[in-house]
């Protein structure tokens, strides 16, 4: 059962796994959630009745029964991990802790104008987990305005002490705010020969890469496949680091694969969710339970529903045995990974999907697209919404994209003459405009947030957010699209589609069925040549066929330019402006979303 509230002056007795230091009980709960085994925790707040060495301790706990005896203790705050909850979870922590010194390895010291600048520095430094900043009121003159970047093995402080006139906080890498490069490539036949900080067993290089991503010290990894000559190292995932942050030596070795932590891309690709099945593969670990199951999919469901289950192995039924049900072995380990991986025994193995909620919803695979044609099918573009105005009569005004359960991203120019959000209606999960009747459910708009530098579409900043009055429940037909990672600025997208109900040619009427067109991106340099009277800035992106015929048209304004990269859809552009409809040689101009990620996050994550 999901329990979110914290229990004041309460301590859970026993079940200790490990102790870490956190600046608040709230953050202790997040650490517990991300720990592979933690189900409960007890945090000790600062208090005159407590020994100062115990202040800020966060004791992570486990229990077979998923609960522990409660004891009254002043300054103790206890609670449960969010593992038991179905809601979206994020490790993003923007809080600044006043008069707290979070201890760690101080590996970088520099002058900063503010705590915010110090936090930005930490976010953009590959090694930094957290920071402490001495304010200008700090007693020691030579330490004033000093920004200390810190890291630890666990990613959490080794100790936290009270210290006047300093502030501390965490890196915002997990908030998708890092400018560090996002390197998704996995390099075959390559070994990175740097120091190992840890090693785990993994079924493939992709899982290894995802484990590296959420390991606090891992910057890159090497994975030895099951064909690796040395048997004892097969399926071994080596988590690595280096002082420079990059591998110092690459060695060519067959049957090994290497890659990088995806910490700078984690908002736009799954890093916790290992959804694949591994055939003829057995995962070894501590057995939690053995249950009869009809299929490996059913076994995965059982594992996902058992809060302590981390991975499973399913052995299919022998002919006509046990009503055709096989055995489902639910398992766990200290680190969430199998202790050993065996092949050739006929088992089918996989991981719990419980961790998928730690990934952004937008990374969920959607059903395959229908190739060819211009009319979309239901569920093909589940982030696409139709924005209607009810004044003077109800009509389709613009497209838009779901980017969060209360947020639609669209174009600012859509709101010319719109006096109030009250006249707006957002319809999601719609394929045909004719589906929209008087009684069709819609989302009301609570607030229109237009970029404050917007003047006209052609001058840029053509971006707006709609805050919905109620939250969107994600389904197959309405779910968010990922924002591009700032670390992805240099990605060359090759699978881009523009969608909308807008005009397909000049003076045409709104289409009934959602239209789609695959269009290539055009360099800004080439685009500028096509629009000699307009400045094509780096905050714009252009797309369109050289021979014309396919482009966004009026009515598609505000809708998405969606590009698929590494199996995940990204909102690369917002349809903004351009010459007519599919005018040959004149590309469409879109708002370049990656350049507004900070703005979007600032507005959507504002308290």
């Amino acid at each position: 059962e999901c329990v979110t509230q914290l229990l004041k002056d309460t301590c859970f007795e026993g079940g200790d796994i490990t102790t870490v230091f956190t600046p608040s009980a709230k953050y202790c709960q997040v650490v517990c959630t991300y720990h592979p085994r933690c189900l409960l925790f007890t945090f000790t707040a600062e208090s005159p009745s407590e020994d100062p060495t115990r202040w800020f301790t966060c004791v992570l706990k486990d229990s077979v029964t998923e609960t522990l005896p409660r004891v009254n203790r002043t300054a103790a705050i206890s609670g449960y991990s969010f593992k038991q909850c179905s809601h979206q979870i994020s490790a993003c922590n923007k809080d600044i802790y006043v008069d707290l010194d979070m201890k760690g390895i101080n590996y970088n010291s520099s002058v900063a104008k503010s705590a915010q600048e110090c936090q930005e520095r930490c976010t953009d430094d590959v090694h930094c987990h957290f920071f402490t900043y001495a304010t200008r009121q700090f007693p020691s003159l030579e330490h004033r305005n000093i920004c200390l970047l810190k890291h630890t093995q666990t990613g959490t402080p080794t100790r936290i002490t009270k210290l006047d006139k300093v502030v501390s906080g965490f890196s915002l890498k997990s908030c998708a705010l890092s400018n560090l490069a996002c390197i998704r490539d996995i390099f075959p036949n390559t070994v990175f020969a740097d120091s190992n900080i840890d090693s785990v067993m993994a079924p493939d290089a992709f899982v290894c890469g995802r484990i590296c991503t959420h390991h606090p010290g891992c910057l890159f990894f090497t994975f030895f496949s099951q064909e690796w000559p040395k048997e004892s190292q097969r399926n071994l995932c080596l988590l690595k680091t280096s002082e420079s942050g990059l591998p110092s030596t690459r060695i060519k070795k067959s049957k090994a694969l290497s890659g990088f932590s995806l910490q700078s891309c984690r908002h736009s690709i799954p890093v916790f969710c290992h959804s694949s099945f591994y055939h003829d593969t057995d995962f070894l670990g501590e057995e939690l339970d053995i249950v009869a199951a009809k299929s490996h999919e059913a076994c995965q469901k059982l594992c996902t529903n058992a809060v302590r289950c981390q991975f499973f192995t399913y052995t299919p039924a022998q002919a006509s045995c046990n009503e055709g049900k096989g055995k489902c072995y639910l398992k766990l380990s200290s680190n969430g990974s199998p202790t050993k991986i065996l092949h050739g025994r006929g088992g089918i193995s996989g991981y719990t999907l419980r961790l998928c909620k730690m990934d952004n919803e937008c990374t969920t695979k959607i059903k395959p697209r229908i190739v060819g044609g211009t009319a979309s099918v239901r569920g093909e573009w589940p982030w696409q919404v139709t924005l209607h105005t009810t004044s003077p009569t109800q009509r389709h005004l613009c497209g838009g994209s779901i980017i969060g359960n209360q947020w639609i991203l669209t174009a600012a120019h859509c709101f010319y003459g719109v006096e109030s959000p009250k006249i707006l209606r957002v319809y999601s999960g719609i394929l045909n405009q004719s589906e929209i009747k008087e009684d069709t459910s819609f989302f009301g708009v609570q607030e229109i947030i237009i970029h404050d530098q917007y003047k006209m579409a052609e001058s840029g900043y053509d971006i707006a957010l709609l805050k919905l009055e109620t939250t969107v429940n994600y389904t197959d037909s309405q779910r968010p699209i990922c924002l591009p990672s700032k670390g992805d600025r240099n990605v060359i997208y090759t699978d881009c589609w523009v969608t909308g109900w807008g005009y397909r040619k000049l003076r045409d009427k709104i289409q009934n069925t959602l239209q789609k067109a695959k269009i290539p991106l055009v360099t800004n340099e080439e685009c500028q040549k096509r629009y000699r009277g307009h400045k094509i800035t780096h905050k714009m992106i252009c797309a369109g066929y050289r021979e014309g015929g396919k482009d966004a048209c009026k009515g598609d304004s505000g809708g998405p330019l969606s590009c698929k990269h590494n199996e995940v859809w990204h909102l690369v552009g917002i349809t903004s402006w351009g010459e007519g409809c599919a005018q040959r040689e004149r590309p469409g101009v879109y708002t370049n979303v990656v350049e507004y990620v900070d703005w979007i996050l600032e507005k959507t994550q504002a308290v």
Partner: antibody
Framework: QVQLVQSGAEVKKPGASVKVSCKAS????????IEWVRQAPGQGLEWMGV????????NYNENFKDRVTMTRDTSISTAYMELSRLRSDDTAVYYC?????????????WGQGTTVTVSS | DIVMTQSPDSLAVSLGERATINCKAS??????VAWYQQKPGQPPKLLIY???NRYTGVPDRFSGSGSGTDFTLTISSLQAEDVAVYYC?????????FGGGTKLEIK
């Protein structure tokens, strides 16, 4: 009806500057680009640059970049082209023209032309 | 810059006969080609845009054709008032460039 009316002929000395005006009427001035094209005696047409009256954005031909300045005054629907450091080979008829499309394209309306003579 | 090469430089055609002027672009300019007519002492006048679209008020004896890099302006039956210099222009890539002109006279 759409009209572009240019200022009168100018005679200038080498090294001087000339400023030609182009007053638009009969359409929304800020909705179309204004291009400047020149034609030397007995020669062809040469594009000098463009101004977007809506935003004020300008884009000049590399050949004129360091000598030409295009401006506009939207309150009186007038575009201006100033050419500095005049040389004798700048003697030409200077035309302003409106583009057929909002974003560029062929030039559908032209001013009557302004003759600029550069002579010592 | 894209170079537009017009041919011939001059052309003499009898009244009522067909006149053909060619224009070759140094690289593909898609359909972004226009044709202008200029009479002495007057500004150029738009005849054809997007290769083959006749501008408002232009007689239907004027037609444009071509694709990619090769384009043609055709006057199906030459009239006395068609005596002028004709220019092609590409609008595909900035800077827009004009052909050198073709002087059309009556034979």
């Amino acid at each position: 009806q759409v009209q572009l009316v240019q200022s009168g002929a100018e005679v200038k000395k080498p090294g001087a500057s000339v400023k030609v005006s182009c007053k638009a009427s009969g359409y929304t001035f800020t909705n179309y680009l204004i291009e400047w094209v020149r034609q030397a005696p007995g020669q062809g047409l040469e594009w000098m640059g463009v101004i977007n009256p809506g935003s004020g954005y300008t884009n000049y031909n590399e050949n004129f970049k360091d000598r030409v300045t295009m401006t506009r005054d939207t309150s009186i629907s007038t575009a201006y082209m100033e050419l500095s450091r005049l040389r004798s080979d700048d003697t030409a008829v200077y035309y302003c023209a409106r583009t057929y499309g909002k974003y560029g394209g062929a030039m559908d309306f032209w001013g009557q032309g302004t003759t600029v003579t550069v002579s010592s | 810059d894209i170079v537009m090469t017009q041919s011939p430089d001059s052309l003499a055609v009898s009244l009522g006969e067909r006149a053909t002027i060619n224009c070759k672009a140094s690289q593909s300019v898609s359909n972004d080609v226009a044709w202008y007519q200029q009479k002495p002492g007057q500004p150029p006048k738009l005849l054809i845009y997007y290769i083959s679209n006749r501008y408002t008020g232009v007689p239907d004896r004027f037609s444009g054709s071509g694709s990619g890099t090769d384009f043609t302006l055709t006057i199906s039956s030459l009239q006395a008032e068609d005596v002028a210099v004709y220019y092609c222009q590409q609008d595909y890539s900035s800077p827009p460039t004009f052909g050198g002109g073709t002087k059309l006279e009556i034979k």
